[in-house]
């Protein structure tokens, strides 16, 4: 059994935050959409991912992880630039593969410190050790030497596009984990909402049976699907209100009459 | 239906090692969808996580810092079963020791548990 | 290490009567898409722990329709809609969102 080193960050542990902001508590805000969001967390000093509501919330909220640790790491870009350099890599690289405890599928990246390189691996959704990066490009960053890596990958963001539901035609990621995608249309014109309203229901890659509901912009409802419990996308709500109130507000019905609430 | 049953000393000598088995039956030490834990209970420190291995594509194991030079889990693939053994042990040690299961596909939790040990650790 | 705070710690209970118990984490516990890394157990006198319910608002199988979960961030609650008697017993919430797993100091749920 091989013994893992810690996951402690000693370089950064002792610092304070560069504003006062980042000692908030996380705040997903009264709204119930399910925008993937990052904050920094006073009591392990790290950027970590939560849920933001989609309204109110606070300042310690940022859409990348990268935006978050530039903002409340102190010398975090000086640190990224040495280790990327060659000079100093944080011991994390340098922990073995752990696809954690639980057994979703995510795609992630780590570095492999034998062949130099950050490679993909799957993780499972839980635990697992912090050579785990959520994209190859921040990988490269904090573990390679940025003067041999090729241009970052682009990742398909699936919030600027909706599925017409035929059939396969590639894979790419949502929210770092591998499905299968479909034909890319235009959003519709008559929806002015949330764009993740739009995407289907899609019921993940684990084997729960958990009920949940997504809003069909077809028919303007929330509908009940089977969630399996890891992975899927944002158009996933535990209640038919949640879903109604989050999604039902931004179909148009006709250019005279405006939002149906 | 999974079932844990746990078996070793209740009492234990201190500085000395203390030595508990788990038997499976229901599953298998080397499944990929479960993870294989100790857990100790008792009155000052309430449940108290020590530590767990699981198999994917290779072992790994995780320990609790507070025992991480002391502690070793080890499974056996030919009994379908995993042990425990926590050396230099004191009387702060003594406790209600469980093994469990964490299920890893569906449940994400320690959805079994065995019976129970209480180790005393006194000379 | 994440600490979770239970209130109260002792709870005394009518049948047929609610219960609610809360948990709070020291840190907020990462969930995605509503799941959340925050489990419910019970352990009833003389028995080990059981699962009640997993990520937060699932109830494990064979678990009664009267116990739900909910909760965000670092603030969790388990609910008992009409307590039995046979529902007495220390209820422990647990994270798994880092490394070590931890759990809180128990909630002690008996009849009045």
């Known amino acids: 059994l091989s013994e893992e080193a810690d996951d402690t960050d000693s370089e950064l542990g002792s610092m304070k935050p560069l504003h006062t902001f980042c000692a908030m508590k996380a705040d997903d805000g009264p709204c119930k959409a399910m925008i993937r969001s990052y904050f920094f967390n006073m009591y392990t000093h790290q950027c970590e991912e939560f849920i933001y509501g989609g309204c109110e919330g606070n300042e310690n909220r940022f859409d990348t992880l990268e935006e978050c640790k530039k903002t409340c790491i102190p010398g975090y870009e000086k640190t990224a630039v040495k280790a990327a350099s060659g000079a100093e890599r944080p011991d994390f690289c340098f922990l073995e593969e752990d696809p954690g405890l639980c057994r979703g599928y995510m795609k992630r990246y780590l570095y492999n410190n034998q062949t130099k390189q950050c490679e993909r691996f799957v993780y499972g959704g839980c635990l697992g050790n912090r050579n785990n990066f959520e994209t190859l490009d921040e990988c490269k960053k904090i573990c390679e030497n940025p003067v041999h890596s090729p241009s970052p990958v682009n990742e398909v963001q699936m919030s600027d596009y909706v599925t017409d539901g035929n059939t396969v035609t590639d894979r790419s990621t949502v929210n770092n984990i591998v499905v299968p995608q479909s034909p890319k249309v235009p959003r519709r014109r008559d929806y002015r909402g949330r764009p993740w309203c739009l995407q289907p229901a899609d019921s993940g890659l684990c084997k729960a049976s958990e009920r949940r509901f997504y809003y069909n912009s077809a028919t303007g409802k929330c509908h009940r699907f089977n969630y399996t419990g890891c992975g899927g996308n944002n158009n996933n709500f535990t209640t038919r209100r949640r879903c109604l109130r989050s999604c039902k507000t931004g179909l148009i019905k006709n250019k005279s009459k405006g939002v149906v609430k | 239906q999974v079932q844990l049953q746990q078996s070793g000393p209740g009492l234990v000598k201190p500085s000395q090692t203390l030595s508990l088995t788990c038997a499976i039956s229901g599953d298998s030490v080397s499944s990929d969808s479960a993870a294989w834990s100790w857990i100790r209970q008792s009155p000052g420190r309430g449940l108290e996580w020590l530590g767990i291995i699981y198999k994917r594509s290779k072992w790994y194991n995780r320990y609790a810092v507070s025992v991480k030079s002391r502690i070793t889990i080890n499974p056996d693939t030919s009994k379908n079963q995993f042990s425990l053994q926590l050396n230099s042990v004191t009387p702060e040690d003594t406790a209600v020791y469980y093994c469990?299961?964490?299920?890893?596909?569906?449940?994400?939790?320690?959805?079994?548990w065995g019976q129970g040990t209480l180790v005393t650790v006194s000379s | 290490d994440i600490v979770m705070t239970q209130s109260p710690l002792s709870l005394p209970v009518t049948p047929g009567e609610p219960a609610s118990i809360s948990c709070r984490s020291s840190q907020s516990l990462v969930f995605r898409f509503g799941t959340t890394y925050l489990n419910w157990y019970l352990q009833k006198p003389g028995q080990s722990p059981q699962l009640l319910i997993y990520k937060g608002s699932n109830r494990a199988s064979g678990v009664p329709d009267r116990f739900s979960g909910s909760g965000s961030g670092t603030d969790f609650t388990l609910k008992i809609s009409r307590v039995e008697a046979e529902d007495v017993g220390v209820y422990y919430c647990?994270?798994?969102?880092?490394?070590?797993?931890?759990f809180g100091q128990g909630t002690k749920v008996e009849i009045k």
């Open positions: 469990a299961r964490w299920h890893s596909d569906k449940m994400w939790g320690f959805d079994d």
């Open positions: 647990q994270q798994y969102d880092s490394y070590p797993l931890t």
